[in-house]
């Protein structure tokens, strides 16, 4: 019964495909993936951004966004909890929300940028739920109705798991986007050796390269604080 | 303004069931989150649950888990408490509060409060 | 669950004085407290969110402050109208839970 439940809510989602907006359901404490699909051909060059909707009017306030380097965009970011990677060959933005608290829940957009502009890809609610047992399984998510405000709106089929530490789910993709990184690394050094030798200079002491594969600088952003109708 | 308007007291014999609604008007019903707070007498305060109408999906103080439902009906503005299997000692003013959040859709600071319905539980 | 332990149970004060009401949590609730008053008969009032923020139409006089587990709710000068309940309560977790309450009662 249960996988045949999962089925027709994959199926729902699956029609439901072209809504404004997407429910993703999690649980407090653990983790949240969201994903946001897109034209990779249409959108390609640009880096991506995640942001939280202050209000029903107002401005989408940046949480997190991809690396600086479109290439690198595969690259994990994190701000705080919040974790961003971009498959830009396979079109998909996936952001990470660890430690899942009621505070999460929310509007939230996934968007496309380009100079100051920013398209947005999906529109995202977030659900959290209290406990796992709480909560019948996926058969009995909520979908919205004739009546709900969110007429636009379906529910995600992927709720909430926990994330291994230190588990990184990179697309197939990125990982041919990581071996040529590395593959113009060795490039690069190679090359650098080579002019070193040419030019009698001692090797090791080659040019630093703008690659950075492994490591991912990210930054913090500083968090507003809540608006409120008091 | 937003306004939280409760149903009457109730008088309810142990191991029944009793269902209090409390109204919105005045603001967005949708998107903030109701709580709902009992009070026993001379007692503290204490959460038993909320909901946010747009998610339809309740969450739960544990002490309450499988004999309170939390409801909303968004076309009248309207969430539900119902809890079953009444003791004595659920005796107590119950409120409904709304949470004064505007992106967070948990903010927790419950800014609007009903009148509060007192609910006696007594053979 | 967060445990929230407020101190003194009972505070005796004259108008005009200041009065300070602590409460304790038993874990990390971030800055996500609020302060509520309520006065016999009637529902609790909102006065205090996320730590330290007055909710409208609340008068200066009432200032929150603290973060993590120590928060404190200072009223500078009381007034006749402001003997009553006060109940602090977290909203980091679910269950959101309430502390036991502290009574300010003139003397």
């Known amino acids: 019964m249960e996988p045949l439940r999962l089925l027709i809510l994959l199926f729902v989602t699956e029609l439901s495909g072209a809504h404004n907006t997407t429910v993703f359901q999690g649980v407090a404490g653990q983790s949240l993936q969201v994903s946001c699909p897109y034209d990779s051909m249409k959108h390609w060059g640009r880096r991506k951004a995640w942001c939280r909707q202050l209000g029903e009017k107002g401005p989408c306030q940046r949480v997190v966004s991809t690396h600086n380097l479109w290439l690198l965009s595969f690259l994990r970011r994190w701000n705080g909890s919040t974790a961003i990677t971009d498959d830009t060959l396979g079109g998909t933005l996936t952001i990470t929300l660890r430690n899942l608290q009621p505070h999460d829940a929310g509007l939230y957009q996934c968007q496309s940028l380009h100079g100051s502009e920013a398209d947005t890809l999906r529109k995202v609610l977030v659900e959290v739920l209290a406990d796992p047992l709480d909560h019948r399984d996926a058969g009995d998510l909520w979908f919205p109705g004739e009546s709900e405000s969110f007429e636009d709106a379906h529910v995600e089929h992927s709720i909430s798991r926990s994330l291994l530490e230190g588990e990184i789910p990179f697309p197939p993709t990125s990982i041919l986007l990581l071996l040529a990184c590395i593959f113009l690394i060795k490039i690069l050094a190679a090359s650098a050796l080579w002019a070193a030798a040419w030019h009698g200079q001692k090797p090791g002491t080659h040019p630093p390269s703008e690659l950075d594969c492994g490591h991912d600088p990210g930054y913090q952003l500083q968090t507003l604080p809540g608006l409120r109708d008091t | 303004q937003v306004q939280l308007v409760q149903s009457g007291a109730e008088v309810k014999k142990p191991g029944s069931s009793v269902k209090v609604s409390c109204k919105a008007s005045?603001?967005?019903?949708?998107?903030?989150?109701i709580s709902w707070v009992r009070q026993a007498p001379g007692q503290g305060l204490e959460w038993m649950g909320g909901?946010?109408?747009?998610?339809?999906?309740?969450n739960y103080a544990q002490k309450f888990q499988g004999r309170v439902t939390i409801t909303a009906d968004e076309s009248t503005s309207t969430a539900y408490m119902e809890l079953s299997s009444l003791r004595s000692e659920d005796t107590a003013v119950y409120y409904c509060?709304?949470?004064?959040?505007?992106?967070?859709?948990?903010?927790?600071?419950?800014?609007?409060w009903g009148q509060g319905t007192l609910v006696t539980v007594s053979s | 669950e967060i445990v929230l332990t407020q101190s003194p149970a009972t505070l005796s004060l004259s108008p005009g004085e200041r009065a300070t009401l602590s409460c304790r949590a038993s874990?990390?609730?971030?800055?996500?407290l609020a302060w509520y008053q309520q006065k016999p008969g009637q529902a609790p009032r909102l006065l205090i969110y996320?730590?330290?923020n007055r909710a409208t139409g609340i008068p200066a006089r009432f200032s929150g402050s603290g973060s993590g587990t120590d928060f404190t709710l200072t009223i500078s000068s009381l007034e006749p109208e402001d003997f009553a309940v006060y109940y602090c309560?977290?909203?980091?977790?679910?269950?959101?839970?309430f502390g036991g309450g502290t009574k300010v009662e003139i003397k």
């Open positions: 005045g603001g967005t019903f949708s998107s903030y989150a």
């Open positions: 996320d730590a330290s």
């Open positions: 874990q990390s609730v971030s800055s996500y």
């Open positions: 309560q977290q909203s980091s977790n679910w269950p959101w839970t």
């Open positions: 509060a709304r949470d004064s959040g505007n992106y967070d859709y948990w903010s927790g600071a419950l800014r609007y």
């Open positions: 909901i946010i109408p747009i998610f339809g999906t309740a």
